[in-house]
């Protein structure tokens, strides 16, 4: 009995439907075929749990948070193997293990072994504004969100005609900061912040009004 | 009580101009964005433009860049839209929206009764 | 542009019952919701705004609640004064967006 070589890992957006690949060859007919579907959660790697199981020509539930979101891609028994699992969420990332047995057939490599990541595009941002808005004035825009597998990366543009900052903004991209030092009336404006990974953008938009100081009356 | 009056509206020809006007009273206008919005017939709302408080700033929706202009006066407490190159398809009710203050940008916390628009030869 | 979805476009109903119109976004928009009514002839009135609050006059019997993609506003007990058309419109992105309008009519 052999289980072929699987691509590595599987990644999928979170919601949908994860395929995990795991098939093999035999010499035997498939009246004995026992299979075992393990994950490693990459959340808790000190905590294997069974998905599912086919034995004995039937099929068996594994961990409750799988029930009815796993099954089999084909009828079993089948050489492939492969199962999809519906509706995938964040805790679904893990090292997933197929251990197949076909007796009388022994020997050869009986496991199969595919990582799975379930990627999350960014939430909304929160941009906000520290520092004093007063002319001559330091202040850093902030933006980050509170979701986003891969972490996201942050990107502010000036809504105006250029979509430039102003010259005298410095940004981190990764933090999702603009310092702009010595604020003056052509920093004012409305800015957006755009938190992107590699399945998706969101974005939040902050308003920046210097004031002036208000002339003394004499 | 915050109050926005328009008025300019009317029946306009394919490629005329038209500049509405909306009078804000009831608040401090010059700390406000202002924005306006509009509504063809039996259709949705659309946002059109944008201005900050001090004017400094101005947006506009792609459907309009380069023939709408927003601009204000303070002093007059006045919003105002100049409409060029109008087509068919500018034909709508126009509203124009206060924004509610700071963080908020891009909410439209009051609105004017709006000005009909009608562009047709 | 971020687009918006409300659903249903039209529904029927009668004074007493509890309405619900949903509202999804393109894209994750986290709070930056609000929602306006608008009578026939009448300008649009901010109703709700950030997805939850009430806007200040706005009687009680109108919620909002959702964050992300997914919002509902409801009408907890529908009044005759009540029957118009909704709207839900985002402030996370430019261009500020609508969604197409829910019209809520006498059964």
């Known amino acids: 009995l052999e289980v072929s070589e699987s691509p590595g890992s599987v990644q999928v957006a979170r919601g949908q439907t994860a395929v995990l690949p795991c098939a093999f060859s035999t010499s035997a007919a498939l009246l004995n075929l026992n299979v075992i579907w393990m994950v490693i959660p990459l959340s808790n790697a000190n905590q294997p749990e069974q998905v599912i199981l086919y034995q004995g020509g039937q099929m068996f539930d594994g961990a409750l948070r799988f029930h009815g979101r796993v099954g089999f891609t084909g009828t079993m028994p089948a050489t492939n193997v492969s199962i999809f699992i519906n509706n995938t969420q964040l805790s679904d990332t893990g090292t997933y293990q197929c251990l197949v047995n076909n007796l009388p057939d022994r020997g050869g490599r009986n496991i199969g072994v595919t990582g799975l990541t379930v990627l999350v595009p960014p939430s909304a941002p929160q941009c906000q504004i520290q520092g004093s808005q007063d002319l001559g004035s330091d202040v850093i825009l902030l933006c980050s969100s509170e979701e986003g597998i891969p972490r996201p990366t942050y990107l502010w543009e000036k809504l105006d005609n250029t979509l430039k900052l102003p010259p005298t903004a410095t940004q981190d991209q990764v933090q999702g900061t603009v310092t702009i030092r010595n604020i003056s009336a052509l920093s004012s404006g409305l800015y957006q912040c755009v938190a992107s990974n590699a399945i998706g953008t969101s974005t939040c938009l902050l308003d920046l009004q210097v004031i002036s100081p208000q002339p003394r009356s004499v | 009580e915050v109050q926005l009056l328009e008025s300019g509206g009317g029946l306009v020809q394919p490629g005329g101009s038209l500049r509405l006007s909306c009078a804000a009273s009831?608040?401090?206008?010059?700390?406000?964005?202002m924005s306006w919005v509009r509504q063809a017939p039996g259709k949705g709302l659309e946002w059109v433009s944008a201005i900050s408080g001090s004017g400094g700033s101005t947006y506009y929706a792609d459907s309009v860049k380069g023939r709408f202009t927003i601009s204000r006066d303070n002093s007059k407490n006045t919003l105002y839209l100049q409409m060029n190159s109008l087509r068919a398809e500018d034909t709508a009710a126009y509203y124009c929206a206060r924004m509610a203050a700071g963080a908020s940008w891009g909410t439209f916390d009051y609105w004017s009764q709006g000005t009909l628009v009608t562009v047709s030869s | 542009d971020i687009q918006m979805t409300q659903s249903p476009s039209s529904l029927s109903a009668s004074v007493g019952d509890r309405v619900t119109i949903t509202c999804r976004a393109s894209?994750?928009?986290?709070?930056?919701l609000n929602w306006y009514q608008q009578k026939p002839g009448k300008a649009p009135k901010l109703l709700i705004y950030a997805a939850s609050s009430l806007q200040s006059g706005v009687p009680s019997r109108f919620s909002g609640s959702g964050s992300g993609t997914d919002f509902t506003l409801t009408i907890s007990s529908l009044q005759p004064e009540d029957f118009a058309t909704y709207y839900c419109?985002?402030?996370?992105?430019?261009?500020?967006?609508f969604g197409q309008g829910t019209k809520v009519e006498i059964k």
């Open positions: 419109q985002q402030r996370s992105g430019s261009p500020l967006t």
């Open positions: 894209q994750s928009i986290s709070s930056y």
């Open positions: 009831g608040f401090t206008f010059s700390s406000y964005a």
